[in-house]
């Protein structure tokens, strides 16, 4: 994918609200282009913080101001509403509400939108077409919550428009504005190390790959041209500079490490794979 983000592309906003007791609460709001955080919400000033120079996409200042106002009102409204109905809904303090909403793009076309609310980490209600529906497993509490949420039809209409119209328009503008950043190619660095000993007479070999962008990468321990199926890939982890880090490990008998190598394939290397040989690896550190 030319823009360095895996299909389907998504933009979503997450709202995590913690209710400690009737009067003490806090919230975290963030905006994400796939797995890249692009926005955050400053609760003190009730403003959207743009984390990348291109995070405004092609929206005007006026549009951003209106969205800020809407988010501010809805945040206040949500807090007040949840606090008001907490007892009726049998929400027991302390509890957490998580909301995620956004849209997906497939081959440049909108493939869908979503808005889901979870209570204590479990699916509770979701927004479908133009109204809130309970998850069947969530029971009567969720049904009652939907009844409350669906009282304001105009609010639901605007929510529907934000998901089906504003969000897809925003993604396209964001991709265009961030093209240079999202299409960049950053070469990985790789190095080898010992992992914690898995047992007597065995070694854990670790191949570290860091500083690469975009995210898709292939890392494998090899013996000659043969891939070692025992290779364990960790999660691809984000670095503070927007690049990625990955480690791949392999457990072997001490005498079988000599002709092993770690091979790294990445789009930035243009076919020139990085190959590091364990026998050349310095055991210092």
């Amino acid at each position: 994918n030319a823009d360095g983000l895996k299909e389907p592309l998504s933009f979503h906003v997450t709202w995590i609200a913690s209710f400690y007791n009737h009067s003490w609460k806090q919230n975290l709001v963030s905006g994400w282009l796939s797995d890249l955080q692009t926005h955050t919400w400053d609760s003190n000033s009730s403003t959207i913080v743009f984390l990348c120079p291109w995070s405004r996409g092609n929206f005007s200042n006026e549009e951003w101001k209106e969205l800020e106002t809407l988010f501010r009102i809805r945040t206040i409204r949500s807090f007040e509403g949840i606090r008001r109905y907490a007892h009726e809904l049998q929400f027991e303090y302390p509890f957490e509400i998580q909301v995620t909403g956004g849209c997906e793009l497939h081959s440049g076309k909108v493939s869908g939108s979503f808005l889901q609310l979870a209570y204590q980490g479990s699916d509770f209600v979701s927004f479908q077409n133009n109204s809130w529906l309970p998850y069947p497993v969530a029971g009567n509490m969720a049904k009652h919550f939907c009844k409350v949420l669906n009282q304001n039809q105009h609010e639901n209409d605007i929510t529907h428009n934000l998901l089906s119209d504003t969000c897809p328009r925003f993604i396209l503008g964001l991709l265009d504005a961030g093209k240079a950043h999202l299409q960049r190619q950053v070469k990985p660095e790789a190095w080898l190390s010992h992992g914690p000993s898995p047992g007597p007479g065995h070694l854990q070999l670790v191949c570290h790959v860091s500083g690469f962008y975009p995210k898709p990468v292939w890392v494998m321990w090899m013996r000659g041209e043969q891939e070692q199926q025992g290779t364990q890939r960790g999660d691809i982890l984000p670095s503070a500079d927007g690049t990625w880090y990955l480690r791949a490990t392999l457990e072997v008998a001490a005498g079988e490490a000599a002709d092993l190598s770690c091979r790294v394939k990445h789009s930035s290397l243009e076919g020139q794979d990085i190959v590091l040989y364990w026998e050349h690896h310095s055991s210092v550190g």
């Epitope: 106002t69 304001n152 039809q153 605007i158 529907h160 428009n161 934000l162 119209d165 504003t166």
Partner: antibody, heavy 116, light 107 residues
């Protein structure tokens, strides 16, 4: 900047119908709703209803369900209100207004006079 | 439907002075109230929404407060251009309804 340009004044006979327009500019038409409000001299303001241009769904005040029909054309960023079976009670100024968190921007109004 | 009772229906005040208008809803409207300024021959103007949030470019002489069923709107340091009719609107659920209006005159 946001602008709502309404069509000109209408003079109609009792029993006739009129269709007025509201052309929107300066914003993304499909993100917002379009509302209509009636103002009669010494009668105050009445909310007629709204259309969501994105989904074409409508919500009406019960008092106007059989009187007003709201439509929208996304290709021309224009909302319309059709008033049928006109009587002298329908003589008023009709405003269109953009809806988001509430009705924030309004048109200049279309005056309708029903007279025989 | 929710009824909005606005008072007074008219008032007269001096330049530089302060006026307050109230709206009482027939039931709790959860702070979903807006205030508008109507002037003859001009499109209406939204001044305040969600009880106390000022629209961009509206001077801070305008303010709003309230909760539940009782809401108020004030203009301080009155200026000649404030001569207008002011309306409250509730938009908590459908149908939205307006107050009867308050005509403001300058002494």
């Amino acid at each position: 900047q946001v602008q709502l340009q309404q069509s000109g004044a209408e003079l109609a006979r009792p029993g006739a119908s009129v269709k007025m327009s509201c052309k929107a500019s300066g914003y993304a038409f499909s993100t917002y709703t379009m509302h209509w409000v009636k103002q009669r001299p010494r009668q105050g303001l009445e909310w007629i209803g709204y259309i969501n241009p994105n989904s074409a769904s409508t919500s009406y005040n019960e008092n106007f369900k059989d009187k007003a029909t709201l439509t929208a054309d996304k290709s021309s960023n224009t909302a319309y209100m059709h008033l049928s079976s006109l009587t002298s009670e329908d003589s008023a100024v009709y405003y269109c207004a953009r809806g988001f968190y509430t009705m924030d921007y309004w048109g200049q109004g279309t005056s309708v006079t029903v007279s025989s | 439907d929710i009824q909005m009772t606005q008072s007074p229906s008219s008032l007269s005040a001096s330049l530089g002075g302060k006026v307050t208008i109230t709206c009482q809803a027939s039931q709790d409207i959860n702070k979903y109230i807006a205030w508008y300024q109507f002037k003859p021959g001009k499109g209406p103007r939204l001044l305040i929404h969600y009880t106390s949030t000022l629209q961009p470019a509206i001077p801070s002489r305008f303010s709003g407060s309230g909760s539940g069923r009782e809401y108020s709107f004030s203009i301080s340091n009155l200026e000649p251009e404030d001569i207008a009719t002011y309306y409250c609107l509730h938009y908590d659920n459908l149908p939205w309804t307006f107050g009867g209006g308050t005509k403001l005159e300058i002494k």
